[in-house]
C-alpha cells in the first residue's frame, strides 16, 4: 500500500528538552516520491503559525527518508515554544503536528525542579523526560 503522498513524520505531542546556549537541530522527517516538496518551518503564536524567515535550514537526504532541518546555533531562551513544518506539494499544503521545544536557560538551570518536585508534580516529569527523542543520523 505504498502511497506517493508526501508525509511529515512528526508525532502528536512530540517534545524536546534542550539547553539554552547549545546548538540544536530540529528535524522534520519528510517522505516524498519524485520531486522534493518545498518545506518551511513556522513557530506557533497562539493559533497562528508565523513563518520563520531568515533562519538557517538544510536538507539531509537518506535512503528512504529526508530531513528538513531548522538550525538553532545556539538555542536562545525565547526559542521555547511550538513549531510546525509544512510542505507544499502539487499545490497542496501538508502540515505536520506541532513539536514543542522546552528551553532551559542555563542561568536558571540551578532552579530546575528537584527530584522531589518531579515526583509530586508529574506533569513536570512528563515535560522534562518524555518524548524528547532527537534522531541523529
Amino acid at each position: 500500500k505504498e502511497s506517493c503522498d508526501v508525509q511529515l513524520y512528526i508525532k502528536r505531542q512530540s517534545e524536546h528538552s534542550i539547553l539554552a546556549g547549545d546548538p540544536f537541530e530540529l528535524e522534520c522527517p519528510v517522505k516524498y516520491c519524485a520531486n522534493r516538496p518545498h518545506v518551511t518551518w513556522c513557530k506557533l503564536n497562539g493559533t497562528t503559525c508565523v513563518k520563520l524567515e531568515d533562519r538557517q535550514t538544510s536538507w539531509k537526504e537518506e535512503k528512504n527518508i529526508s530531513f528538513f532541518i531548522l538550525h538553532f546555533e545556539p538555542v536562545l531562551p525565547n526559542d521555547n515554544g511550538s513549531y510546525r513544518c509544512s510542505a507544499n506539494f502539487q499545490s497542496n499544503l501538508i502540515e505536520s503536528h506541532s513539536t514543542t521545544l522546552y528551553v532551559t536557560d542555563v542561568k536558571s538551570a540551578s532552579e530546575r525542579p528537584s527530584k522531589d518536585e518531579m515526583a509530586s508534580r508529574p506533569w513536570l516529569l512528563y515535560r522534562h523526560h518524555h518524548h524528547h527523542h532527537h534522531h541523529h543520523h
Epitope: 508525509q7 511529515l8 513524520y9 502528536r12 505531542q13 502540515e95 505536520s96 503536528h97 506541532s98 534522531h135
Partner: antibody, heavy 121, light 112 residues
Framework: QVTLKESGPTLVKPTQTLTLTCTFS??????????VSWIRQPPGKALEWLAH???????RFNPSLKSRLTITKDTSKNQVVLTMTNMDPVDTATYYC?????????????WGQGTLVTVSS | DVVMTQSPLSLPVTLGQPASISCKST???????????LNWFQQRPGQSPRSLIY???KLDSGVPDRFSGSGSGTDFTLKISRVEAEDVGVYYC?????????FGQGTKVEIK
C-alpha cells in the same frame, strides 16, 4: 503482505501479570511512520485501545490503564510485547495487536486474529 | 476522553438497499494539522476488525466502493449504497485526534 499474530496465555489468575507478544511480518518497526497498537474487546462488547508504540520507541497509553501497562518492541525479532499487571476478571477479553500506518498520524489498517485471555481463579 | 456515540446500535437492512450509520463525538475531531482522524472498522462475526475508511472518507485498500464516509467536526456518517450479505457484522467508528484514542460502541448490521 502485512500479517500480525498475538500469542500468550489463554488463562491467567487474578493479580497475576499478563504478557502478550505480537509477532508481525511485512513491515519493519524501525521504518518512519510505522507503529503497533494493542486493542482489546471484552466478550460481546466494544473495542478499547490500550497502548501504542511508534517506530522511534515513543509510547502512548490509555490513561485509565497506564499504571498497569508496559509496551516494548524488539525490531530484530519483529515483535511487540504488552504486559498488564494485576489482572482482574474484568480484563477478560480478546486482545488484538494492530499495525499502525501513517497518514498525518497513526491509523490501524491491519489487525491480528486476536487471542482470548480469561482471568479466573 | 472523547466519547464516540453511534446510532443506531442495531440496523436491520434489506439486501440491495442502502444503509447509514451515524457517529458523533463529544469534541471536534479536526486536528490542528487540518486533518480529521476519524476511521471506520467492520467486524464480521467471529473475525478481527477490518479497516474500511480512514481520514473520514478515504477508502482503505480492497474495500468495495459501495462503502463511503462523510462528515466533519463532530458528526460523521458511514454509508453502504447497496447492502450485500457479506456486509453483516458490527461497525465501529474510531477517533485518533485526541489521546486516548477511542472507539464507538458499535452498530450491528443484520439482514431483515
Amino acid at each position: 503482505q502485512v500479517t500480525l499474530k498475538e500469542s500468550g496465555p489463554t488463562l491467567v489468575k487474578p493479580t497475576q501479570t499478563l504478557t502478550l507478544t505480537c509477532t508481525f511480518s511485512g513491515f519493519s518497526l524501525s521504518t518512519f511512520g510505522m507503529g503497533v497498537s494493542w486493542i482489546r474487546q471484552p466478550p460481546g462488547k466494544a473495542l478499547e485501545w490500550l497502548a501504542h508504540i511508534y517506530w522511534d520507541d515513543d509510547k502512548r497509553f490509555n490513561p485509565s490503564l497506564k499504571s498497569r501497562l508496559t509496551i516494548t518492541k524488539d525490531t530484530s525479532k519483529n515483535q511487540v510485547v504488552l504486559t498488564m499487571t494485576n489482572m482482574d476478571p474484568v480484563d477478560t477479553a480478546t486482545y488484538y495487536c494492530a499495525h499502525g500506518n501513517w497518514d498525518g498520524e497513526t491509523y490501524f489498517d491491519y489487525w491480528g486474529q486476536g487471542t482470548l485471555v480469561t482471568v479466573s481463579s | 476522553d472523547v466519547v464516540m456515540t453511534q446510532s443506531p446500535l442495531s440496523l436491520p437492512v434489506t439486501l440491495g438497499q442502502p444503509a447509514s450509520i451515524s457517529c458523533k463525538s463529544t469534541q471536534s475531531l479536526l486536528d490542528s494539522d487540518g486533518k480529521t482522524y476519524l476511521n471506520w472498522f467492520q467486524q464480521r462475526p467471529g473475525q478481527s476488525p477490518r479497516s474500511l475508511i480512514y481520514l473520514v472518507s478515504k477508502l482503505d485498500s480492497g474495500v468495495p466502493d459501495r462503502f463511503s464516509g462523510s462528515g466533519s467536526g463532530t458528526d460523521f456518517t458511514l454509508k453502504i449504497s447497496r447492502v450485500e450479505a457479506e456486509d453483516v457484522g458490527v461497525y465501529y467508528c474510531w477517533q485518533g485526534t485526541h489521546f486516548p484514542w477511542t472507539f464507538g460502541q458499535g452498530t450491528k448490521v443484520e439482514i431483515k
